[in-house]
């Protein structure tokens, strides 16, 4: 299911990098979140629960990431103009069932003031 544009601030700039915020419902217990740049998978994070509610976090394509109870943040560093693109949060929900996939995204604009290490 494609949801289209994120209805929240998806990009947060700091120190020449960007935090890309991928939100999900806090009812969701087990999921995979992928960050797509165009159609390419940049990062992913999978959260599963084992017996005794032990939480497991795995990444096949590792990026610096941060997990909360309703979002995954992926961090991109050393921004340059090539980072300008459409970025999508591709959420696959395993628990609660049934399995659902939802895609939200937005365009990352790169302005001179946000670039890393710009010449003064």
């Amino acid at each position: 299911e494609i949801n289209g544009s994120a209805n929240y601030e998806m990009f947060i700039f700091h120190n020449g990098g960007v935090q890309i915020l991928c939100k999900y419902p806090d009812i969701v217990q087990q999921f995979k979140m992928q960050l797509l740049k165009g159609g390419q998978i940049l990062c992913d994070l999978t959260k599963t629960k084992g017996s005794g509610n032990t939480v497991s976090i795995k990444s096949l394509k590792f990026c610096h990431s941060q997990l909360s109870n309703n979002s995954v943040s992926f961090f991109l560093y050393n921004l340059d103009h090539s980072h300008a693109n459409y970025y999508f949060c591709n959420l696959s929900i395993f628990d609660p069932p049934p399995f659902k996939v939802t895609l939200t995204g937005g365009y990352l604009h790169i302005y001179e003031s946000q670039l890393c290490c710009q010449l003064k």
Epitope: A6, K23, Y24, P25, V28, P97, P98, K100
Partner: antibody
Framework: EVRLVESGGGLVQPGGSLRLSCAAS????????MHWVRQVTGKGLEWVSA???????YYSDSVKGRFTISREDARNSLYLQMNSLRAGDTAVYYC???????????????????WGQGTTVTVAS | EVVLTQFPATLSLSPGERATLSCRAS??????LAWFQQKPGQAPRLLIY???NRATGIPARFSGSGSGTDFTLTISSLEPEDFAVYYC??????????FGPGTRLEIK
Amino acid sequence: EVRLVESGGGLVQPGGSLRLSCAASEFIFNSYDMHWVRQVTGKGLEWVSAIGTAGDTYYSDSVKGRFTISREDARNSLYLQMNSLRAGDTAVYYCTGDRTVVRGVNYYYFGMDVWGQGTTVTVAS
Amino acid sequence: EVVLTQFPATLSLSPGERATLSCRASQNIRSYLAWFQQKPGQAPRLLIYGASNRATGIPARFSGSGSGTDFTLTISSLEPEDFAVYYCQQRINWPPITFGPGTRLEIK
């Protein structure tokens, strides 16, 4: 008018098999998760099995390993293959559908808002 | 498995009276609760989803409330066609999806 029509019920001996079908019309079948719910005469409702829009399947413990749910979206059809039937499987079987929509941080569940009229399965020798 | 308990098992009231039906869950199901009405020989009909949202075509005299573990279905002024069996149902902690045992609403 939204319609679900079940068929395939009947009398079968213990250990036998039946295949139930459910034909849908007038709604977007492939956007619905579909379920089979059964009811013994004079008793309450019991969930049997479900299949998600992605084809993921779920079963109650009482039918796991004996029943198989499937769907054919191109034909707007839902099926329940019932094997190794027991007397305890005797009931009216309803097909029903519900929807879950995820929007950002929101998880919406809209309930089982479409139901068929039911088909009767009797397991007896 | 989430166990749903409904009470009373039977409720005897007259047309025009207010009916209050209760459903209790064995664990927190937030607001993911639905109510159904079933008449003899008919399939169940969805009345309420998300604990408090009326389904399409359901009269305003039906209302739902509650969250967590305690839920209520209220019929503000009973019509003759409202006498039936009412079931609550959860579909957030599953499988299995579970239904309550039902409350029979009968004419006094």
